[in-house]
């Protein structure tokens, strides 16, 4: 049309001195924030700040107590094949994209989920639920922990002998079951061992169930007030304080874990315990408990669909090479959980061959592992006290770093929900206070004398693996189908360099909906009510309460879907084609100006929004 | 494939206004920010600004921000550039580009239109 | 704003020649540098991005490097479809900004 005198103009330019273009505005930095905005987002000092965060945040307890049980309940060596199908189907993909978006994004687990797709943004919402659910009790099992740490200082470890106040006149030693003839014979008559009874009548004070709370164990209670002091102060200076700490409570364990190693694979007994570990039995595959036992380790073990990888992700520079580094952290997760299973199940060996009894009758998952076998081990080892003080410190790191990584998630989620307020002074310190109150307070429940069914009630539910599977599926579905599994490769393109292979992407589409799918399906129908030691059922106003506890998160997806429908006005298709386009794309922005204020609403392409606080915080 | 279509020329008055027009084919229009650049003889190329269209969301050049007014209509997935009180020192080639990725940052731009000309004269 | 300047307005080459344009930043851009190449007939074209990143179907002799406030295009085998204008623009911090331009020419 006008190409003759698009030409002359072209021309004109290329004669001309070119000189730079001069410009007025002031810019703002890529992580600046516009003035008076809240102040700029923190970024990880260093990768390996980032890296030990994650490390810390995923090699927790589980690795050590449930994997190794898990394998030898699962069919051993073959468990290891639904394992790896899941930690290649679903986990790592999981993982990766929960570490990406909050890379991607530069925000928490909640608001992350508003800039993708408003429409889901109640998946944010359901893991900020779990997460908060679980470092309420989580905890609990490190003031349990710290208990026993600090009965070890003894010269003789107090759950070693029959001679003390809480023990019973059924009490035995475990002396005395060496001679198998001898236990056989007595064994109808129902005998406990002093570790049992230290556990159960000592540090829970067991009451006969959990209409029975009765009254608070104020050593307890000062252990859980003290590791939670603790970890208040590894977080409260944001990652500037998380990201050092984890220099010693990420490294440490391991060394731990190879001490305890090299001690388990030194004991007599050793070698059975490990066979039995690990012999492959591939008639156990047969049955569906195995695959959902392997689909809801792997999402435990990954620490996914907490919001917490996403709050990490969200720390780091957005060129960062997470890719690479996330394939790493997958193989130091899983291969820490398989080399604590020889560190275990060792020292269960060599405990059977002590005892005169089969490993089965050892092998414990669980609290029941770290503080009944395990402490029950220690006594047969020469230098217990050692041995066991190692034991504690190690499981309490493990635990530690965890917990606070979970509780960092917990925040970096809820202040980018109100940055401008919760971002401004102390403000963040005064609110990571308050939730860390009020989680004690709530974690008061479980360290009275019914704390435990409290506890149990919590594990099975809140935390549970439909839940996580649930938040999972929504995930990949949103990510996969809504935003476009291209669309994200775009941008971590940007990011890192180059696209990752089409494993991560058709494993989003297809692999890990359909495993969460199968997982959840088979979960629901091969439900079992909770009870406690196999023996205690618990009421059905506990189970009600503990499906309440479940669906508080689950139903955060469906529910945001309703409210966001109903904040949002117009013709219905243009609402959801309005809500499933990714808000807030440009983190770098200075303004935002094109939002027409009308009858005190907004109108955005011809759907009226009203005025939320999300839809203030991330919009305007 | 991506494509954004521009009119060729602009003819105008000084102290007149024009809305140039950058229709988008190829993707879904309202997810990405769509930029504007101006080219003029002398100066090189300048950033107006950027516009994106699911939630109007805009960052000006404050060089262009009382000249400019950046629109969208999703409908017919066209950005509009509004100039407005037009002087000889407008004039240039006019170029809409959009980013390539939908999230997080918007700083270079792979596909661009053909440019329209804007010539004021009286 | 961050000033971008790109020190030679117009350059003379032979084909098959090396050839590097130039450009600099007024402070430290942190690697978010991109090139663009305009061609005669007004048509733009992303280069490179991000300092050395280079764009899909952009042939292999084009380079990029540099780092802080320097940074360079290389155009290690003059070819005729080369012939246009290089701009370089920073995309560290808002507004972006452009460098003047430099105009490549065949002797």
């Known amino acids: 049309m006008a190409t003759k005198e698009k030409l002359q103009c072209l021309k004109d330019f290329h004669k001309d001195i070119l000189k730079p273009s001069p410009g007025k505005s002031p810019g703002t930095r890529p992580e600046d924030e516009a003035e008076g905005k809240p102040p700029q987002r923190e970024k990880w000092s260093s990768k390996i700040d980032f890296v030990l965060s994650v490390a810390g945040g995923f090699v927790g307890l589980g690795n050590v107590w449930r994997f190794p049980y898990l394998c030898y309940k699962n069919g051993g060596g073959a468990f290891l094949i639904p394992y790896f199908i899941f930690l290649f189907g679903s986990g790592l993909p999981v993982f990766f994209l929960e570490i990406i978006i909050g890379q991607y994004t530069s925000e928490g687990g909640i608001t992350c989920w508003e800039k993708i797709c408003p429409l889901f943004s109640g998946i944010g919402y359901a893991s900020v639920v779990i997460v908060s659910l679980l470092n309420v009790y989580y905890i609990v099992i490190l003031a349990w922990a710290t208990y026993y740490l600090f009965q070890s200082f003894q010269k003789e470890l107090p759950w070693a002998h029959c001679n003390h106040s809480w023990n019973t006149p059924h009490c035995m030693e475990d002396t005395m079951r060496k001679n198998k003839s001898v236990w056989i014979t007595i064994s109808s008559t129902n005998f406990t061992s002093p570790v049992i009874e230290f556990w159960e009548r000592n540090v829970l004070s067991l009451s006969p169930g959990i209409d029975h709370p009765g009254s608070l164990k104020w050593d307890l209670a000062l252990c859980l007030l003290l590791v939670w002091l603790v970890c208040f102060f590894c977080i409260w200076k944001g990652v500037r304080s998380t990201g050092k700490v984890v220099y010693f409570t990420a490294t440490f364990p391991f060394a731990m874990l190879l001490v305890l190693l090299v001690r388990g694979l030194t004991l007599p007994g050793a070698g059975a315990g490990i066979k039995f570990y690990l012999y492959p039995d591939i008639t156990r595959l047969e049955d569906p408990q195995v695959w959902i036992d392997a689909g809801t380790q792997i999402f435990f073990s990954y620490a996914i669909c907490l919001g917490a990888m996403t709050s990490l992700g969200s720390y780091n520079k957005y060129k960062y090479n997470s890719y690479r580094d996330c394939m790493l952290l997958g193989c130091l997760n899983s291969g820490t959980s398989f080399v604590s299973g020889f560190a275990i199940f060792s020292i269960l060996g060599f405990m059977a061959q002590e005892q005169g009894v089969d490993i089965a009758d050892v092998a414990e998952s669980g609290p029941g592992l770290a503080f009944i076998a395990y402490p029950k081990a220690v006594t047969m080892m020469p230098l217990p006290t050692f041995w066991s003080i190692l034991f504690f410190i190690m499981l309490l790191l493990l635990g530690l770093d965890s917990q606070f990584v979970e509780v960092e998630g917990q925040i970096t989620s809820l202040v980018d929900l109100y940055p401008s307020f919760l971002r401004k002074g102390y403000r963040r310190e005064i609110f990571i206070a308050f939730v860390c109150s009020i989680s004690y307070l709530l974690g008061l429940t479980m360290v009275t004398e019914g704390g435990m069914y409290v506890f149990q009630l919590f594990d099975y539910y809140a935390a549970s693996g439909v839940c996580l599977l649930w938040v999972a599926f929504f995930e990949c579905f949103v990510i996969a189908w809504i935003y476009g599994g291209d669309n994200l490769y775009d941008g971590i393109e940007d990011m890192i360099g180059y696209r990752p292979g089409p494993w991560m992407k058709y494993s989003w589409a297809v692999i890990t909906p359909v495993l969460c799918v199968g997982c959840f399906i088979f979960s629901l129908v091969k439900y079992v009510p909770l009870t406690y030691n196999k023996t205690y059922v618990y009421p059905n106003w506990a189970i009600g309460l503990g499906w309440s506890l479940a669906l508080s998160s689950m139903l955060c997806v469906p529910l945001v879907i309703v409210i966001r429908l109903c904040q949002t006005e117009g013709p219905f298709l243009v609402r959801v084609k309005y809500l499933l386009t990714p808000r807030e794309p440009n983190r770098w922005a200075v303004e935002r100006e094109g939002a027409t204020p009308y009858n005190s609403r907004t109108v955005m392409n011809g759907a009226l929004v009203k005025p939320t606080h999300i839809i203030v915080e991330t919009m305007m | 494939q991506v494509q954004l279509q521009q009119p060729g020329a602009e003819f105008v008055k000084p102290g007149t206004s024009v809305k140039l027009s950058c229709k988008a084919s190829?993707?879904?229009?309202?997810r990405y920010w769509i930029n504007w650049v101006k080219l003029r003889p002398g100066q090189g190329l300048e950033w107006?600004?950027?516009?994106?269209?699911?939630?109007?969301?805009?960052n000006y050049n404050e060089k262009f921000k009382s000249k400019a007014t950046l629109t969208v209509d999703t409908f017919s997935s066209t950005a509009y550039m509004q100039l407005s009180s037009l002087a000889s020192e407008d004039s240039g080639l006019y170029y809409c580009?959009?980013?390539?990725?939908?999230?997080?940052?918007?700083?270079?731009?792979?596909?661009w239109g053909q440019g329209t000309l804007v010539t004021v004269s009286a | 704003d961050i000033q971008m300047t790109q020190t030679t307005s117009s350059l003379s080459a032979s084909l098959g020649d090396r050839v590097t344009i130039n450009c600099r930043a007024s402070?430290?851009?942190?690697?978010?540098l991109n090139w663009y190449q305009q061609k005669p007939d007004g048509t733009v074209k992303l280069l490179i991005y991000?300092?050395?990143r280079l764009h899909s179907r952009v042939p292999s002799r084009f380079s990029g490097s540099g780092s802080g406030t320097d940074y360079s295009l290389t155009i290690s085998n003059l070819e005729q479809e080369d012939i246009a204008t290089y701009f370089c623009q920073q995309g560290n911090m808002l507004p972006w900004t452009f460098g003047g331009g430099t105009k490549l020419e065949i002797k």
């Open positions: 402070q430290d851009i942190s690697n978010y």
């Open positions: 580009a959009r980013c390539k990725t939908m999230l997080s940052r918007c700083a270079w731009f792979p596909y």
């Open positions: 991000d300092t050395s």
């Open positions: 107006i600004g950027n516009i994106y269209p699911a939630t109007n969301g805009i």
């Open positions: 190829g993707y879904n229009f309202t």
